[in-house]
Interface confidence: medium
């Protein structure tokens, strides 16, 4: 499934974000605009749009460049520059801008209901307008095989500039050099060549204390094809939000400081350093080694499908879930299911631009994974894929066009955390992290944002299952994994994100950070919010009228446990519907290289696998955490 979040058209120019993260290659950008009966804007067209109020905080393709149109200076958007900010080195995946010649010459915020020029295909494409309306259609618009089947869960986004970089202005355009650590797959490559499957395994816990585990995995690129065609609709929300990256690193992540590059970085880096890896799409390079994005994965289809647990479910955001995966990134690819976002409005649709850029919340979880690498998860993609960033990207409203849908905003209120998993460096075994993130709420909801921030609660999950079967097998790990999440307001992490980007190359750097997104509603982040804290609600129940569901959040206190501390906090559906997150048959690749297909049925609410104890296991061993009573 692919979610395309689009903005209003300004003089025909609009921004399109795919799956909540930078996951569009140049070739896909051209195909995407073509599907919208548009073309990549020229610089002149972009300048025209800028002149009538178009600005974002997201890098996107235009003809010949990757830019961010900025009207108002913002330190986290285009390095505080204004004008059409040009990223000089654009070797990665970004969002895209499109130009529709038939659009009104001024601002046009009518809803786009379809991709007029999409061709027949198996992909569920959801167009999310800034007002929150979602239009779904089946089809395909991508033609480049590499866009379609990225094989490596490349961190496409991985590339990012370091915070130290500065942009230089030239000729009225701002040229920003974005250093990319990992070249992302050539946008041109056909054939799926993304190779890695990232699989963050997710552990979901229901509020009832039953732990449900879902190993969500990155879909193997090809298997591939079959996966491509999996209907993601059925997969729904994985309510997972918090993620701990235990990427083998002991350090806790440092906060992510907004940096000039954040616009990109956020997506791009997750900072994982890894050696080389992929968007992860998407998805989405083959190694996890690079800083894979949390879910990135993949890129492209996979991306979207992948991890989206609930991307479309605003509610899910609310539910925080811990994703713990010990997975040798290399091996598992299960990609359990594509969660279909369609069903719900994005919490916030993107236009998270700014906020996106700025990863603020630095609440990091103190998770100490057994391994030594740390990964940074920038929240942005946090939810990957389709999610639309509900928590993450809410654009602060820097973008004039980006206003979040109301539904989304409201939903926000209650999303305490989001997590994301980032694959770790290539062979590191712990790649997922727990990345609690506060959800930005709509401006009006800010208060909600912090909820209970002061109280730090934590749930310590003790894996009951064989440690070796833990989420996605800790191939490298031998001992039991006890995880703790330390989340508390008090944790102030250094927000400096120095190093984050730079560390991309270093597999050991894994910073977990949850960056806060701005409120969706568009306002810039509220300085008052405690960005760093994750919002864990104490027994907070939020009702989502639109879904008629209510979710109970379990208080999480941070419990710090020794070196493995990964805490999983999961707030699940009070109904325990977490299980529904996975469904559908999926082929998963295991480290062994073999693939097996798991069948999950949405109908039973569990995605196959043993359900005892409420734990679902899907393709891939998953550790079942127990929540102490």
């Amino acid at each position: 499934q692919i979610d395309l979040n689009i903005t209003c058209r300004f003089a025909g120019v609009f921004h399109v974000e795919k799956n909540g993260r930078y996951s569009i290659s140049r070739t896909e950008a051209a195909d995407l605009c073509k599907a919208f009966n548009s073309t990549l804007p020229t610089m002149a067209q972009m300048e025209k749009a800028l002149s009538i109020g178009f600005e974002t905080c997201r890098y996107g393709f235009i003809e010949g460049h990757v830019v961010i149109p900025r009207i108002h200076p913002n330190s986290i958007c285009a390095a505080n520059n204004t004008g059409v900010y040009i990223l000089t080195s654009n070797t990665s995946q970004y969002d895209t801008y499109c130009f529709n010649a038939s659009a009104p010459p001024e601002e046009d915020c009518t809803s786009v209901t379809d991709l007029p020029n999409a061709f027949d295909g198996p992909i569920t494409i959801t167009i999310v307008n800034r007002d929150g309306t979602r239009y779904v259609q089946k089809g395909e618009y991508r033609t480049n095989p590499e866009d379609i089947y990225p094989s490596n869960p490349t961190d496409d986004d991985v590339s990012s500039g370091s915070s130290s970089e500065r942009s230089s202005t030239s000729g009225g355009y701002i040229f920003y050099t974005f250093s990319t650590v990992h070249p992302i797959p050539d946008e041109d490559s056909p054939w799926i060549t993304d190779s890695t499957d990232r699989i963050p395994a997710t552990t979901l816990m229901s509020t009832s204390a039953t732990a449900t585990e879902t190993a969500t995995k990155r879909q193997e690129t090809w298997d591939w094809f079959s996966w491509l065609f999996l209907p993601s609709e059925s997969k729904n929300h994985l309510h997972t939000t918090t993620q701990m990256a235990g990427t083998s690193s002991n350090t806790i992540s440092a906060g992510w400081e907004p940096n000039e590059e954040n616009e990109d970085e956020r997506d791009r880096h997750l900072s994982f350093s890894g050696s080389g890896i992929d968007d992860d799409e998407d998805f989405i390079s083959s190694t996890i080694s690079t800083t894979p994005r949390a879910f990135d994965h993949t890129k492209q289809n996979q991306d979207w499908t992948q991890w989206n647990p609930s991307h479309s479910n605003p509610e899910v955001l609310l539910q925080t879930t811990t994703r713990m995966t010990d997975v040798d990134r290399n091996g598992t690819t299960a990609y359990e299911g594509n969660w279909n976002p369609e069903a719900h409005p994005p919490l916030i649709h993107h236009e998270h631009h700014e906020e996106e850029e700025t990863p603020h919340s630095t609440s990091t979880i103190q998770a100490t994974p057994s391994s030594t690498t740390e990964e940074t998860a920038t929240q942005k993609e946090q939810w990957f894929g389709n999610r639309w960033h509900e928590g993450y990207r809410q654009t602060p409203k820097e973008d004039s066009h980006s206003t979040t849908g109301t539904a989304a905003a409201s939903a926000h209120t209650s999303h305490p955390m989001q997590g994301r998993t980032t694959p770790s460096p290539e062979d590191s075994s712990w790649t997922d992290f727990f990345n609690p993130i506060s959800h930005p709420m709509g401006r009006g909801h800010q208060a909600g944002r912090r909820m209970d921030m002061d109280s730090s609660h934590s749930i310590t999950l003790q894996p009951t299952a064989n440690p070796n079967t833990g989420l996605v097998e800790d191939l490298d790990r031998t001992g039991p994994l006890s995880m703790t999440t330390q989340q508390s307001n008090s944790q102030s992490f250094s927000t400096s994100h120095e190093g984050l980007e730079e560390d991309k190359d270093h597999p050991t750097t894994s910073t977990l950070t949850s960056s806060n997104r701005n409120d969706v509603t568009g306002g810039r982040r509220d300085p008052n919010h405690s960005e760093g804290s994750t919002t864990l609600l104490e027994g907070y129940t939020s009702h989502y009228p639109h879904t008629k569901e209510s979710r109970t959040f379990i208080p999480v206190t941070s419990a710090k446990t020794g070196s493995f501390g990964v805490t999983a906090v999961t707030v699940g559906d009070s109904n325990s519907n977490v299980n529904r997150s996975l469904s559908g048959d999926q082929d998963t690749f295991h480290p062994s290289g073999g693939s097996h297909t798991t069948h999950g049925s949405e109908s039973d609410g569990h995605s196959h696998g043993s359900q005892e104890g409420g734990a679902n296991t899907t393709s891939g061993p998953i550790r079942t955490p127990q929540i102490p009573e």
């Epitope: 070739t27 061709f119 027949d120 295909g121 198996p122 395909e140 991508r142 033609t143 480049n144 095989p145 590499e146 089947y149 094989s151 490596n152 869960p153 490349t154 990992h182 070249p183 797959p185 050539d186 946008e187 041109d188 490559s189 056909p190 054939w191 799926i192 060549t193 993304d194 190779s195 890695t196 499957d197 990232r198 193997e220 690129t221 090809w222 591939w224 094809f225 079959s226 065609f229 050696s275 080389g276 890896i277 992929d278 390079s285 083959s286 190694t287 996890i288 080694s289 690079t290 040798d328 990134r329 290399n330 091996g331 690819t333 290539e426 690749f589 295991h590 480290p591 290289g593 693939s595």
Partner: antibody, heavy 117, light 108 residues
Framework: QVQLVQSGAEVKKPGASVKVSCKAS????????MHWVRQAPGQRLEWMGW????????KYSQKFQGRVTITRDTSASTAYMELSSLRSEDTAVYYC??????????WGQGTLVTVSS | EIVLTQSPGTLSLSPGERATLSCRAS???????LAWYQQKPGQAPRLLIY???SRATGIPDRFSGSGSGTDFTLTISRLEPEDFAVYYC?????????FGGGTKVEIK
């Protein structure tokens, strides 16, 4: 510039195994899958399988399943394709390929493997 | 698996002429996931077209692809001397990836 350089020609006896290497340069090896395709004399190209260079996962064509093993050494940015139980009909030029449309040489130059008793 | 049949097997033309190569699939190729390659003697194949009609980087615009479903066509509007080679179509919409038998474009 993307470049894939393969190991030299090999002559093997039936029943033996051959391992062909493919060293990648000009891009981040682990970011892209590596495919292996062979072409017997006068025959069409046959896709053998691919490896997710990032995590080592592989996918093989049913035709070669059980006889082919594709691996990679990320530190050396090299992919390997080993074909066992060689038969005379396995005589072909084996190519590693990064199927992509960018510039450069996404295919290796080919390695001729001759299976002869 | 999807079997791709190319025709004609050999096409004899002169430089400057238009070449039309056909590729028929035994079953519909998902989302037009069809590529065309050019291969010259002793060389590895070179990607020309992907997605049925998108030219790969650096490919001259005299090469164009079209078609969908089961019938695809590669057209070389004006043959240049360097265009005489064997052309293969390949589908990458389902596993295993398969190639056509090739069409040899030779100088008449």
């Amino acid at each position: 510039q993307v470049q894939l350089v393969q190991s030299g020609a090999e002559v093997k006896k039936p029943g033996a195994s051959v391992k062909v290497s493919c060293k990648a340069s000009g891009y981040t090896f682990t970011n892209y899958a590596m495919h292996w395709v062979r072409q017997a004399p006068g025959q069409r190209l046959e896709w053998m399988g691919w490896i997710n260079t990032g995590n080592g996962n592989t996918k093989y064509s049913q035709k070669f399943q059980g006889r082919v093993t594709i691996t990679r050494d990320t530190s050396a940015s090299t992919a390997y394709m080993e074909l066992s139980s060689l038969r005379s009909e396995d005589t072909a030029v084996y190519y590693c390929a990064r199927f992509y449309s960018g510039s450069g040489s996404p295919w290796g130059q080919g390695t001729l493997v001759t299976v002869s008793s | 698996e999807i079997v791709l049949t190319q025709s004609p097997g050999t096409l004899s033309l002169s430089p400057g002429e238009r070449a039309t190569l056909s590729c028929r699939a035994s079953q519909s190729v998902s989302s037009s996931y069809l590529a065309w390659y050019q291969q010259k003697p002793g060389q590895a194949p070179r990607l020309l077209i992907y997605g049925a009609s998108s030219r790969a980087t650096g490919i001259p615009d005299r090469f164009s692809g079209s078609g969908s479903g089961t019938d695809f066509t590669l057209t070389i509007s004006r043959l240049e001397p360097e265009d005489f080679a064997v052309y293969y179509c390949q589908q990458y919409g389902s596993s295993p990836l398969t190639f056509g038998g090739g069409t040899k474009v030779e100088i008449k």
